[in-house]
């Protein structure tokens, strides 16, 4: 968490931004949120990105005033402008590109005073991982698929019943590039799996973390996924 | 409210060019992105460019080389070029304001101005 | 180019009908998908936008979901006044591009 104030004391607000990461081809957020003002038409609202010449996206007078947008931007952000008046300055991001990772700053004035504050943004791309037991195997074989990463992660294996094991030997791990050329999917398999026992397929990057498990037994196949983003400070 | 009126459709001869106007109100041309769409007779809607806010421009690739989009932010107004026409050019030919910023969909649309290509 | 597949190209139907159109992308476009609706001679209508987000009066027995690169625009009860084309469109990258249309005709 980032929180900013104005310069000079008396006129200054506080102004609260997070730290995030964009999934590159989806849509992201960028989090901000200061002191509200009572009248809309006196807030302004200004998001610039570090080494950026124009802007990423301009707010004021209860409307978006985008004619400084720099090209990068162009027809990929907007404000919840219904939101403005509670404080939310919080900007949308449509479809994230590699290169809109970097320092961005949420700029305000309203009538009680100026603030801002910095986020850092990563952008890279994370997926859900899915365990399966791969039939098609000649010994008990686990198959872990997630099919959007980058950059390229580290996949380890766990397993409740063998705690602190290490099954790198027993497992194998590929990257395939997938057709726009950035993100990959990834495959791990593990091998010589024993029933009665939750396996873990961990998919970690400098951007997120994901754990596909999957509890097999004699009667049944139990699955759950999860997905952490790493790395979300406020500020 | 918000409008959108084109102006400037009428017959053009085969090869030269033809420039449409597209006058709008109710919304700042420096807040929003206008976009270009065109119908042939009794056929789909094809997306020919945009002009955004800033002034910068995106265009479909098949019309790169034929078309020119400017504005005057002063008098609310987007101007439309293309060069050298043929008879496939014949459409309706629309503005269009985006629902948001973000572009989510075309909410307000000018009555079209007919264009027609013919010798 | 994404291309936007439409179906059915034509559909008949009589008032108070639940009707469905589909719109398929040929690669994901998240949910920058919208619906038209048009009638001969005048310009689209903006029904859906954001794929699942109605437009400002337009009439609750419209809606769309989906996303990536499935569509769908139902119509729960079918009035005299929806017999029109219907277009899909998607402006997640350039070129935007739009389905052929479905023409909804009374039965």
């Known amino acids: 968490l980032i929180i900013g104030f104005g310069i000079s004391g008396r006129h200054s607000i506080t102004v609260t931004t997070v730290a995030s990461a964009g999934n590159i081809g989806e849509d992201g957020i960028l989090s901000c949120t200061f002191e509200p003002d009572i009248k809309l038409s006196d807030i302004v609202i200004q998001w610039l990105k570090e080494g950026v010449i124009g802007l990423v996206h301009e707010f004021k007078e209860g409307k978006d005033e985008l004619s400084e947008q720099d090209e990068m931007f162009r027809g990929r952000t907007a404000v919840f402008a219904d939101q403005v008046i509670v404080g939310n300055a919080s900007l949308r991001l449509k479809n994230v590109q590699l290169t809109d990772a970097g320092t961005y700053k949420c700029y305000i004035i309203t009538s009680k005073g100026k603030g801002n504050a910095n986020l850092e943004y990563k952008t890279g791309a994370f997926s859900m991982p899915e365990v399966n037991v791969d039939y098609n195997a000649s010994s008990e074989t686990l198959r872990c698929e997630a099919p959007r990463w980058f950059p390229q992660p580290t996949v380890v294996w766990a397993s409740q019943v063998d705690q602190g094991a290490n099954f790198s030997e027993v497992s194998n791990t590929s990257f395939e590039l997938n057709s726009e050329n950035v993100t990959m999917k990834v495959v791990s398999v593990l091998y010589n799996v024993t029933i009665n026992n939750t396996y873990s397929c961990m998919i970690e990057n400098d951007i997120a973390k994901a754990t596909g498990d999957i509890k097999v037994t004699e009667s049944e196949i139990k699955r759950r996924s999860h997905l952490q983003l790493l790395n979300s400070k406020a500020s | 409210q918000v409008q959108l009126v084109e102006s400037g459709g009428g017959v053009v001869q085969p090869g030269r060019s033809l420039r449409l106007s597209c006058a709008v109100s109710g919304f700042s041309l420096t807040s929003y992105g206008v976009q270009w769409v065109r119908q042939a007779p009794g056929k789909g809607l094809e997306w020919l460019a945009v002009i955004w806010s800033s002034g910068s421009t995106d265009y479909n690739a098949a019309f790169l080389s034929r078309l020119t989009i400017s504005k005057d932010n002063s008098k609310n107004t987007v101007y439309f070029q293309m060069n050298s026409l043929r008879a496939e050019d014949t459409a309706v030919y629309y503005c269009a304001r985006d629902v948001t910023t973000i572009v989510e969909g075309f909410a307000h649309w000018g009555q079209g101005t007919l264009v027609t290509v013919s010798s | 180019d994404i291309q936007m597949t439409q179906s059915p190209s034509s559909l008949s139907a009589s008032v108070g009908d639940r009707v469905t159109i589909t719109c398929k992308a040929s690669e994901k476009v998240g949910t920058y998908v919208s619906w038209y609706q048009q009638k001969p001679g005048k310009a689209p209508k903006l029904l859906i936008y954001?794929?699942?987000n109605r437009y400002t009066g337009v009439p609750s027995r419209f809606s769309g979901s989906g996303s990536g690169t499935d569509f769908t625009l139902t119509i729960s009860s079918l009035q005299p006044e929806d017999f029109a084309t219907y277009y899909c469109?998607?402006?997640?990258?350039?070129?935007?591009?739009f389905g052929q249309g479905t023409k909804l005709e009374i039965k």
């Open positions: 469109g998607q402006t997640y990258s350039y070129p935007f591009t």
């Open positions: 954001g794929a699942s």
